[in-house]
Each structure stands twice: as structure tokens, then as C-alpha cells.
């Protein structure tokens, strides 16, 4: 045979290939040996032109020999040398992960090494490299950023040889929720002041939404989605405006039906309504609250009342949203047009929190029927939502 070469070399395998002898032969005898490795001999068919070498030692130079046999005759031997790759370290793991530190541990490769290259990278693209000694099987990472996803990689070194890299992914603690999907998660991160926060719908960094979080009412963690307080904002708006949202989150505003749909699609939410009028207060809580998508015309689900304001939302349960330019209520007349607002009207309302501020004419104002009736426009109203299991989450955080 002639032209003996090796290909597809890894840390434990290689493929030997050769040009066949010109004459027909019965078999080829292959042998290979390396430093501190006993010689292995294999006989293969005379039709064969390649042979897979397996169970090789890593980072080892091998000598490969082959000759042909035909009956009692043997050809001359041809030789080739090759070196197996350095094998990778194994079981790279991040343990003892804190807000700014983590411990990386690994098992060494079978081959002897001269050191290791460690690379760790955060999601924002910050990359750090460190070389550690050959006898090291752990390394403490420091100066990490809290609530950050990291990818750590390790590669074994032996002179000029480098193994394949292996990796592990971990997230530093500090914030329980790096991308809070609602105000409850922002609160569980340690934010306890009411105000503007950025939440991330479905925890997706690309789906950022600025919201006002009420961190004080009944334990806090509420996304406020409606506020009436002074009549400065116009709430007699069209379908498009109610879908998108409008107003100043610090003042009077409506968060938007599309946002409500996306938020309530994240899990089971509860609704809280806070009402204030001339020093009197009342509230209503519904333990199941959701808003459907645009195809359902933002259909309302509201169930499980408790509170002091009276169960006025029950009348609106199961209704689609209505505005003056998209009439989805069950009345012959257009409820939004009649009452100069927008809501999940039926025929027409028990609740009209988006009605005309300060208008005490029957059913025209900011009404919550079972508290102040239809002939009194309430001075202050907020609608807000948070996960129904917030109490459990809060307790878990306190125990932690």
C-alpha cells in the first residue's frame, strides 16, 4: 500500500486511510503505538482502504504502520505519525453563585495539561479571560454584575495544544427577577416605593413597558392601569386610543387594552379598585381578572368579589370593550356615546370609571353604582392588577 494518512483526529479517535496495493491482496495488517501506550495490531480485509482507530489516548503522538499480506507474502511497511487532540475538561459547573461572585469547578482532562484558559462573558458582551495553573480544578469569579446572565467557558492547554471549549451558563443573584414581568416582581426585587418602573412582558427584555406601580395598597405589587383624580385628561377617546393607552402615568391615564391583554395572559391576575371621595374610601377586589385579545374585543373576565365598594363589576363580566366608534355593548343605543366614556359596557353600566370627570348627571360621571350610585361622580379612582398568588410569592421572599 501507499499514501498512508490520518484524518478526523480527535482526543480519542482517528481515521487511517491508504492507497491500496496494485496487486490483489488478502489483507492489511495495521498497528499503532504511542508513548506509554502498548502496540495494538489489527488485520482487515484486502478490500479495505480505511480503518477507524478508537480508544486512543489524548495528547499523544502515535506511530501508525501498515503492510499488505497475500498468502505467505508480506509487502513492505509504510508509516505515518499523528498526534491526538488534547481532551477537554469535564463537568464545568457554577456553584455558590451570589450577586457578584461565583465558583467555577471542573474535572481535569485525562491528558496532562500546562494550564487552563477560562473565559466568562455577560449578556451585555463584556468578556474576561484568565489563565490558571495545571493543578487547578476551581476558580472564584469576582466583580460580577448582579442579576446578570453569564456564559463561562474553559479550555485545557498543553504547550501549543488547545482542547475544545466546554461551557456553563449561570445568572448572578441580587434581583430575584432581572426582567420583572409585573409590579409584583419589581416589588419582590426589593423596590418598595410607588412610582414609575419598567416591566418586561413575559420577562422578555425586548418587551419593555413603563408602568406606575402601587407598592403600598394591601401589600403592594400592583400595576395601576387607570387613574382618575382631577379631570385634566380626556377619557372620551376612540377605540385606537383605548387599545394603545393614553395619558401621563403619574397623573390621569389609561394603560391600554393591548397591554392589559398581554399582562393578564402572563398568568392568573387579581383586580383591585380603589375609590376616594371627600374623605371617604372604598375598595373592591376580584380574585380573577383578565382581558382578552383584540379578536375578542378585549373581553372582560372578572370574578370573586370582596371589598367595601359593592360588587358593581359583576354586571360587566364577560363583556367586550366599547368606545364611541366601536359599539360592542348589548344595548340598542351606543353606551359609550350616551355616557361619554368607554368601558366593558352591557346595557349600559354599573361602573363608568372612564366617564366624564365631575359630571353628576345620571350615569354620565365617574360612577361605581353600589358605592355612590349613578348621580355622583367619584373624585378619585384607580384600577390596578397583580398576580393572584402574590401573597404566596411575598411569603416565600420573606422566608428566603
Amino acid at each position: 500500500p501507499s499514501g498512508l494518512v490520518t484524518a478526523n483526529i480527535t482526543d480519542s479517535e482517528a481515521l487511517a486511510r491508504w492507497q491500496p496495493a496494485i496487486a490483489t491482496v488478502d489483507s492489511y495488517v495495521i498497528s499503532y503505538t504511542g508513548e506509554k501506550v502498548p502496540e495494538i495490531t489489527r488485520t482487515v480485509s484486502g478490500n479495505t482502504v480505511e480503518y477507524a482507530l478508537t480508544d486512543l489516548e489524548p495528547a499523544t503522538e502515535y506511530t501508525l504502520r501498515i503492510f499488505a499480506e497475500k498468502g505467505p507474502q508480506k509487502s513492505s511497511t509504510i508509516t505515518a505519525k499523528f498526534t491526538t487532540d488534547l481532551d477537554s475538561p469535564r463537568d464545568l459547573t457554577a456553584t455558590e453563585v451570589q450577586s457578584e461572585t461565583a465558583l467555577l469547578t471542573w474535572r481535569p482532562p485525562r491528558a496532562s495539561v500546562t494550564g487552563y484558559l477560562l473565559v466568562y462573558e455577560s449578556v451585555d458582551g463584556t468578556v474576561k479571560e484568565v489563565i490558571v495553573g495545571p493543578d487547578t480544578t476551581s476558580y472564584s469569579l469576582a466583580d460580577l454584575s448582579p442579576s446578570t446572565h453569564y456564559t463561562a467557558k474553559i479550555q485545557a492547554l498543553n504547550g501549543p495544544l488547545r482542547s475544545n471549549m466546554i461551557q456553563t451558563i449561570f445568572t448572578t443573584i441580587g434581583l430575584l427577577y432581572p426582567f420583572p414581568k409585573d409590579c409584583s416582581q419589581a416589588m419582590l426585587n426589593g423596590d418598595t416605593t410607588s412610582g414609575l418602573y419598567t416591566i418586561y412582558l413575559n420577562g422578555d427584555k425586548a418587551e419593555a413597558l413603563e408602568v406606575f406601580c402601587d407598592m403600598t395598597s394591601d401589600g403592594g405589587g400592583w400595576i395601576v392601569f387607570l387613574r382618575r383624580k382631577n379631570g385634566r385628561e380626556n377619557f372620551y377617546q376612540n377605540w385606537k386610543a383605548y387599545a394603545a393607552g393614553f395619558g401621563d402615568r403619574r397623573e390621569e391615564f389609561w394603560l391600554g387594552l393591548d397591554n392589559l391583554n398581554k399582562i393578564t395572559a402572563q398568568g392568573q391576575y387579581e383586580l383591585r379598585v380603589d375609590l376616594r371621595d371627600h374623605g371617604e374610601t372604598a375598595f373592591a377586589v376580584y380574585d380573577k381578572f383578565s382581558v382578552g385579545d383584540a379578536k375578542t374585543r378585549y373581553k372582560l373576565k372578572v370574578e370573586g368579589y370582596s371589598g367595601t365598594a359593592g360588587d358593581s363589576m359583576a354586571y360587566h363580566n364577560g363583556r367586550s370593550f366599547s368606545t364611541f366608534d366601536k359599539d360592542t355593548d348589548s344595548a340598542i343605543t351606543n353606551c359609550a356615546l350616551s355616557y361619554k366614556g368607554a368601558f366593558w359596557y352591557r346595557n349600559c353600566h354599573r361602573v363608568n370609571l372612564m366617564g366624564r370627570y365631575g359630571d353628576n348627571n345620571h350615569s354620565q360621571g365617574v360612577n361605581w353604582f353600589h358605592w355612590k350610585g349613578h348621580e355622583h361622580s367619584i373624585q378619585f379612582a384607580e384600577m390596578k392588577l397583580r398576580p393572584s398568588n402574590f401573597r404566596n410569592l411575598e411569603g416565600r421572599r420573606k422566608r428566603a
Partner: antibody, heavy 120, light 107 residues
């Protein structure tokens, strides 16, 4: 199918008590408000009392307030009306009625009624 | 309490006639009005809820309209089975109150 069956009516002397029952079937009982509506012989309909699905809220007509008590046992799918200090003017056919989804102030299913006669 | 006044108290009509019954509330009730039909010896049956919505299974010859204080029940073409007493009821506030009824009989 959805059904309401009243029982417990009868002839009773003024000042005495009577307890009406209503057995419900064919729907998720505790999801709905329930009511009692009465009809005096040859007269129109008069709402008497209502109770929320959970039983947490009860409502009464002024004419029966303090004398009648509405209650429900959701485990037994049953509605009750305890009538005390009965008067002649309480004589009527008493209907049990199911409220609709929402507030439950619209009565979409009615029983056949049970007759209460108050007479000495 | 809100008073409900129906008119007429009774009417005579023939099969095929268009019949209109009105109901007036003593105060504004938006569209919180229901209509019921009652035949002799039978329990009332819900026909129309929220002033204009036809209850499932009720024939389309029945219709309701109105808002605020004035409401109407219309039977477009009276059928033999429609001879009965009709009641309006406000579900706007407790106590829910009924009209005195309108008896529709055969002319």
C-alpha cells in the same frame, strides 16, 4: 336540564313560621345568585329576597325584612326561605328563581312554585 | 323604590296582530329592564333582558326597545300561544320591582 323544585308550602296560622326549600339541578349552583319571588292569588309578581352565589350577601323587600331569612347550602344545591311571624298578606305562590350571570338580578329560570296560605 | 307602570293593563287582539306594551320607570334605569311572559297556572318565563336582548329559545317575533325610563315590548305577529300576561321588571336597583302586568287575550 336546568330545574328548580320548591317545597315546604302549606296552610299556616298568622304569627307562625314556615320554611321553604328549593332544590336546584342542571347548573353550577354556587355560580349564581338565587331569589324568591311571590305572587298573591290573582295579583302580580313581587320580589321577596335574594342571595349571592357564595351566600355572603342577602337582600330583602321591605315588606319581609326582619321576618324572613334567605339562606343557601351550596353543597346540597339548595335554597331556603325561613318565614317567621307570618301574616295574611304573605299568602302567595312562592317561586324560587335563578339569577343570570353578572349581578343575578334578572331571573332566567323559575320553579313551578309552592303555595303558602296564612289563615286562622 | 322604583315604581314600574305598564300600559295597557289588558288588551284584546287577534292572531297576526302587532301588539305593543309599554313600561315606564319612575326614575332613570339605563337599560336595566326585563320582560317576562306568564301563562295561567305556570311560572313566569324570561323573554327579553337588558331592554332589547332576546333570551335564548324565544321566538324572534318578540322584541324590546327603550332606554332610561320608557320601554316597549313588541310582538310583531301575535300567535295563539302568545295569549298570556306580560310583566316588565327593573333590575337596576334593589328591590327589583315588577310592573302590574298586561293581560293579552283573544278578541
Amino acid at each position: 336540564q336546568v330545574q328548580l323544585v320548591e317545597s315546604g308550602g302549606g296552610l299556616v296560622q298568622p304569627g307562625r313560621s314556615l320554611r321553604l326549600s328549593c332544590a336546584a339541578s342542571g347548573f353550577t349552583f354556587d355560580d349564581y345568585a338565587m331569589h324568591w319571588v311571590r305572587q298573591a292569588p290573582g295579583k302580580g309578581l313581587e320580589w321577596v329576597s335574594g342571595i349571592s352565589g357564595s351566600g355572603g350577601s342577602t337582600y330583602y323587600a321591605d315588606s319581609v325584612k326582619g321576618r324572613f331569612t334567605i339562606s343557601r347550602d351550596n353543597a346540597k344545591n339548595s335554597l331556603y326561605l325561613q318565614m317567621n311571624s307570618l301574616r295574611a298578606e304573605d299568602t302567595a305562590l312562592y317561586y324560587c328563581a335563578k339569577g343570570t350571570v353578572g349581578e343575578g338580578d334578572t331571573f332566567d329560570i323559575w320553579g313551578q312554585g309552592t303555595m303558602v296560605t296564612v289563615s286562622s | 323604590d322604583i315604581q314600574m307602570t305598564q300600559s295597557p293593563s289588558s288588551l284584546s287582539a287577534s292572531v297576526g296582530d302587532r301588539v305593543t306594551i309599554t313600561c315606564r320607570a319612575s326614575q332613570y334605569i339605563q337599560g336595566f329592564l326585563n320582560w317576562y311572559q306568564q301563562k295561567p297556572g305556570k311560572a313566569p318565563k324570561l323573554l327579553i333582558y337588558d331592554a332589547s336582548n332576546l333570551e335564548t329559545g324565544v321566538p324572534s317575533r318578540f322584541s324590546g326597545s327603550g332606554s332610561g325610563t320608557d320601554f316597549t315590548l313588541t310582538i310583531s305577529s301575535l300567535q295563539p300561544e302568545d295569549f298570556a300576561t306580560y310583566y316588565c321588571q327593573q333590575s337596576y336597583s334593589t328591590p327589583q320591582t315588577f310592573g302590574q302586568g298586561t293581560k293579552v287575550d283573544i278578541k
